[in-house]
Every structure is written in C-alpha cells, then in structure tokens.
Interface confidence: low
C-alpha cells in the first residue's frame, strides 16, 4: 500500500494505491483511492507513467479528457466514472501489454487540495492449472496443465501423504510457446502416483502463484484450483 500526500499542509489530500499485476491480453485494474469531494466537477484525475511523455488517462469536469493521452494507451483506458465522486480513481486498462509494466502515478486534484501516490504495475501471464489423471500413460500418472504463463514459472509437485518429499526425480515439466510468441503453455507430468492421496501442482513466477490439487482414490477423483497474485501491496 502506498499512501501519498499533497505537498502543502492543509492543501494536501491522501491518495492510496495498491501495487498489482496485469495478465497480458486481458483487462487490468490500477487501483487508486482518494479523499472524496462533494462536486464531481472539482475533481481532476491524472494517471501518468514513468518514462512516458503523454498522459495515461485524464478525467476532469466529470468526463474523460484524452487529448494529451499517450498513443500507447489510446482506446485502452477508462475510469469508473460513477465511482469518482466517492473517491475511486482506479483505472481500467484494456488488453494489457507486456510493455504496460512500470511505475504509475495517480495524481488527484480536488477542491480540498492535491495529492498523489505511485503504483508498481507488473505484467505477465498467469492461468489456473488443471490436474488430471493421465490415462494415456502406462502407469498411474498425473498431468498438470496451465495454458498461459509468462515469465517462465517454476513447477513443484507436493503430496499430502508424503509431505516434504522431493518429486523432481519423478516428474517432468515442459514449456510450449503459444502462438503469440510470448506466453507459454505449462505441462508437468508426475509419475508413480499412489491412490488415497492428494497431490498439488504449484506453478509460480514473480507475478502469480497457482495451485491445482487432485485427490486420487480408487472410486473418485476430486479437483480444485487456486490462483493468487503475489504483488498486491498497498501504497
């Protein structure tokens, strides 16, 4: 969490941002809140990005003002206009690109004063893994697949019964580049699976951590997946 204040005493307002991550090709949110104002027409929101000449987005007098918007963001940004009056300056970024990563500044002007806070935005690709029994294999084998990751993640297998066991010798992980030549499909196979056990396939990079669980018994297979972003720190 980053909390920023304006520069001059009583003319400062608190602005709060939360570091976040964007999944390339999807829409992302850059979070920013501020002390609300009574009049929408008195609120100015400017989003800036370090190293970029133009603005990322500007909202003033109750509407978007995009004439100074940098070309790399054109057509891809929006604020939640109906929530600005309650202090929400968060920015929706459409079709997140790898190059959108960087330091952003949320700069706010209201009738109470000015304030700003920085936000670190990471971009990459992350997706939920799915773990299945691989019936094509000669022995009981688990297959963990996740369609889109970037940068290349690590994959670790764990088991409820054999806690702390190292499965690297009995697993094989491969990364297959997707058609857009950035993200990769992750496939990991675990051999020598025993029944009446729960296995976890954990995929992690510096942006996200995802886990796919599978419970294997003779009579049934139960699956569960979970995805967690790693850098959601408030500022």
């Amino acid at each position: 969490l980053i909390i920023g204040f304006g520069i001059s005493g009583r003319h400062s307002i608190t602005v709060t941002t939360v570091a976040s991550a964007g999944n390339i090709g999807e829409d992302g949110i850059l979070s920013c809140t501020f002390e609300p104002d009574i009049k929408l027409s008195d609120i100015v929101i400017q989003w800036l990005k370090e190293g970029v000449l133009g603005l990322v987005h500007e909202f003033k007098e109750g509407k978007d003002e995009l004439s100074e918007q940098d070309e790399m963001f054109r057509g891809r940004t929006a604020v939640f206009a109906d929530q600005v009056i309650v202090g929400n300056a968060s920015l929706r970024l459409k079709n997140v690109q790898l190059t959108d990563a960087g330091t952003y500044k949320c700069y706010i002007i209201t009738s109470k004063g000015k304030g700003n806070a920085n936000l670190e935005y990471k971009t990459g690709a992350f997706s939920m893994p799915e773990v299945n029994v691989d019936y094509n294999a000669s022995s009981e084998t688990l297959r963990c697949e996740a369609p889109r990751w970037f940068p290349q993640p690590t994959v670790v297998w764990a088991s409820q019964v054999d806690q702390g066991a190292n499965f690297s010798e009995v697993s094989n992980t491969s990364f297959e580049l997707n058609s857009e030549n950035v993200t990769m499909k992750v496939v990991s196979v675990l051999y020598n699976v025993t029944i009446n056990n729960t296995y976890s396939c954990m995929i992690e990079n510096d942006i996200a951590k995802a886990t796919g669980d599978i419970k294997v018994t003779e009579s049934e297979i139960k699956r569960r997946s979970h995805l967690q972003l790693l850098n959601s720190k408030a500022s």
Partner: antibody, heavy 120, light 108 residues
C-alpha cells in the same frame, strides 16, 4: 532515420479508382497510428482518416467526407500504408500525404506527398 | 466534432515585428499543435502540446492558450518565417484529428 514515401498519384477519370501507397522505414511500423491527410491546391489540410496501431487492433476511423468511398489498410510485414479511393470526384484532386502520429496526438513525420488529379 | 477557426487568414508583417495568430476551437480542448508549411513542401511539426517547440524550431516562436483559444507568436519575424501555419487538435469523441484553415504569413 524515419522516412515516409507516398506513391500512386496521377491523372484519374471521374468515377475511377486508385490506390495510394506510403512506404515507411526507420521505425517499428506496427507501433504507430498512421493517417492520410490531403490538401487541395491552395486550400487547407484535411484529415481523411487514420488506422490504429497493433495494441489497438489496427482499427480505422474515417472523416465523414470520405467514409464509404475510401478505405485505409496497412501491411505491417512490409511497413506500408495504403489508401484505396473509389468513385473519385473532381473535388478529390489534391496532394495526398501520409503522416505518423507521435506519442502526443500530433503528426511528427510526413511524407513528401503524391498528387492526384481527377479530371476527364 | 470540434471545428478549429484560424485568424487572420492572411497576416502581413515586416522583419523584426512581433506577430500573433490565433486558433479558436468550437468547444474546449486541452491542447493544440501547430505546423508550418511552405509552398511545395509537406507540413512540418512546429509546436506541439500548446507550447513545446518541435526539434529545430527557432526560439523566437512560442505557443500558448487554453480552453477554446490558442495562439502562436513570433517575437521578431524573419523572412524565412513566411509560410502557412496550421493548428491541429485531437478529439476523442468522436476520435479524429482536426486541422484549422491556416494562417498565411507574408513578409513585407
């Protein structure tokens, strides 16, 4: 060095069609919005339309005066911008420029222009 | 769609004089760009984002303005400044670039 070079102008009969080209070099073509601007003899500049960059899906916008008659396209592998003009009229006679949109919504590089005359 | 009106259409000045040309928008805009065009040549970016001089533009040129009124000023006109100057802005709704009608600067 950024270069934009238009070609394809000349004399065309009313009702005819022509395709103008703008060959570019010196920059990553797919990263930029590209526009066509025309200027009739002795008159002001008029924007015909623009085609967005890769990040924005290469979508197009046209001015009302040419919508439906003119079509912009781009070959990103060859870094070439095109303007297909159909059902030409005498008032389409002009110098046609291609221009690159900078990162600040203005045109930082222009071609030398190609002259089109529509006359019988 | 925003309309840009430039005045005067023709401006005549002697070398050393200070001249100002204006560009008025039909509704408020937050920035204006200017181009210089000489006969037989393509337009050159001259001033961008209201007041920033493009590369190679002499410092005797300046730009200012806000809202619906913008101006280009030459502190001391020189013979090489004879040209037509066009203002231009970007509108996001609908998305389109718009040019003014131009101001032709003549040197006496």
């Amino acid at each position: 060095e950024v270069k934009l070079v238009e070609s394809g102008g000349g004399l065309v009969q009313p009702g005819g069609s022509v395709r103008l080209s703008c060959a570019t070099s010196g920059f990553t073509f797919s990263d930029y919005y590209m526009s066509w601007v025309r200027q009739p003899p002795g008159k002001a500049l008029e924007l015909l339309g623009f085609i967005r960059n890769k990040a924005n899906g290469y979508t197009r916008e046209y001015s009302a005066s040419v919508k439906g008659r003119f079509t912009m396209s781009r070959d990103n592998s060859q870094s070439v911008l095109y303007l297909q003009m159909n059902t030409l009229r005498a008032e389409d006679s002009a110098t046609y420029y291609c221009a690159r949109d900078s990162h600040r919504t203005y045109f930082d590089y222009w071609g030398q222009g190609t002259t089109l005359t529509v006359s019988s | 769609q925003i309309v840009l009106s430039q005045s005067p259409a023709i401006l005549s000045a002697s070398p050393g004089e200070k001249v100002t040309m204006t560009c008025r928008a039909s509704s408020s805009v937050s920035s204006m760009h200017w181009y210089q065009q000489k006969p037989g040549s393509s337009p050159k970016p001259w001033i961008y984002a209201t007041s920033n001089l493009a590369s190679g533009v002499p410092t005797r040129f300046s730009g200012s303005g806000s809202g619906t009124s913008y101006s280009l000023t030459i502190s001391r006109v020189e013979a090489e400044d004879a040209a037509t100057y066009y203002c231009q802005q970007w509108s996001s709704n609908p998305p389109m670039y718009t040019f003014g009608g131009g101001t032709k600067l003549e040197i006496k």
